[in-house]
Amino acid sequence: CEEPPTFEAMELIGKPKPYYEIGERVDYKCKKGYFYIPPLATHTICDRNHTWLPVSDDACYRETCPYIRDPLNGQAVPANGTYEFGYQMHFICNEGYYLIGEEILYCELKGSVAIWSGKPPICEKVLCTPPPKIKNGKHTFSEVEVFEYLDAVTYSCDPAPGPDPFSLIGESTIYCGDNSVWSRAAPECKVVKCRFPVVENGKQISGFGKKFYYKATVMFECDKGFYLDGSDTIVCDSNSTWDPPVPKCLKVLPPSSTKPPALSHSVSTSSTTKSPASSASGPRPTYKPPVSNYPGYPKPEEGILDSLD
């Protein structure tokens, strides 16, 4: 027979030879880190067919690391369901607890003994320090000094000294989250008031209000013969500006085949019409309105769309 087979878990006793006589026997022993559990054979014989009789290393078992208990309020999860050396142990804490120590331990061979690479971690209760105090506002449970996992506080704004109220910018409720960190930044309390939205040749159709505070939403429509340049819906943002900006109502121009009528007093020119939130006059663009919805008015491609002089 030629050289005997090699195995992962056991090794030949003695030096291998280039060839073996029929009937000659070779013995194996478990490799370092493995131990023998009877009754399986750990030898083989050179058969008369010049082949080795069947043998396996199933009798040699990997050394295992000591059993690790689940940490209190957590779990120890063997990576491959085994404690054998070469494998990992993962540690997970239950919700509301966080890990102190190594998240992964390795089962390592020290000499012929399998031991863990470190001490098992512990699971500590998630606790948060009090959330931040905010200017012009307060939060619930302000007297509490330590907050547990998922404990929530809700912010509210103080009454304003002036005519306009404080608006709460951001989420009013935050909770004590993983890593002992609050779920988000604290909100802000400040006066947010947008200017009255003026649209020439159009009007507001919804969202009417005495004043326009944070998140106030207003919709517009243009007069007949005018089209909306911008969004028909605007919202008062946290900077006291309309987002998107206050739209404009621009005149639908007549087809180029007919001479445009002279401006009457009811028509405005673009250089002199402004919304309060718009910027100062710059170069006047050539406006291309969308396809007209107004019966009797041309579609844009039917006429030349010049600047609004």
Epitope: K193, C194, R195, F196, V198, E200, N201, K203, Q204, F208, K210, K211, T272, T273, K274, S275, P276, A277, S278, S279, A280, S281
Partner: antibody, heavy 118, light 107 residues
């Protein structure tokens, strides 16, 4: 508190021009939206136009071809330029600070009288 | 332009009377209506904004109501200092316009 004082009124012939001034004291004219309003016995109160803090303007279209509102920040003054004046433009002209960005006229000046007559 | 029509055009009341002035708009203006008082020899002064909100310093005997096209200014107990011309003003649409005025006199 800003005070607005109108000036520049007087007698002018039909077809003539006049520039009214609105001087601000105790504050910057560029910090406020300034409207011009006029009042006559025959036509009552009429809003003429507004200049916003950003320099933009809106006008009453009935007067837009003849009246122009402007502002000179260095002089802390707003202006109403009136051209092609007619006898029916005879009125007391007020400049007015728009209330905090809202079209509520809470701060009226004392007004300046413009008489258009030949 | 939106027309505002006030009624009556003038009225005479005794001190302590309840006075009602109406303002009708030619189209719906939501609550975008203000009231002013122009006392004799003075510039107009803002009394009420947004239909019913009392401007600072205005006595609470003044009140406003209405919505859409019909609006009312009430003086619960008129006083001698309340004489003058009362104007309504809309601001839903440019040009902002005023009513023709209601003159209030004391008997």
């Amino acid at each position: 508190e800003v005070q607005l004082v109108e000036s520049g009124g007087g007698l002018v012939q039909p077809g003539g021009s006049l520039r009214l001034s609105c001087a601000a004291s105790g504050g910057s004219v560029s910090s406020y939206d300034i409207s011009w309003i006029r009042q006559s016995p025959s036509r009552g109160l009429e809003w003429l136009g507004v200049i916003w803090t950003d320099g933009g303007t809106n006008y009453n279209s009935a007067f837009m071809s003849r009246f122009t509102i402007s502002r000179d920040d260095s002089k802390n003054t707003a202006y109403l330029q009136m051209n092609s004046l007619k006898t029916e433009d005879t009125a007391v002209y007020y400049c007015e600070r728009v209330y905090d960005g809202y079209p509520w006229f809470a701060y009226w000046g004392q007004g300046t009288l413009v008489t258009v007559s030949s | 332009a939106i027309q505002l029509t006030q009624s009556p055009s003038s009225l005479s009341a005794s001190v302590g009377d309840r006075v009602t002035i109406t303002c009708r708009a030619s189209q719906g203006i939501s609550n975008y209506l203000n009231w002013y008082l122009q006392k004799p020899g003075q510039s107009p002064q803002l009394l009420i904004y947004y239909t019913s909100s009392l401007f600072s310093g205005v006595p609470d005997r003044f009140s406003g109501s209405g919505s859409g096209t019909d609006f009312t200014l009430k003086i619960s107990r008129v006083e001698a200092e309340d004489v003058g011309v009362y104007y309504c003003q809309q601001y839903i649409k440019l040009p902002w316009t005023f009513g023709q005025g209601t003159k209030v006199e004391i008997k």
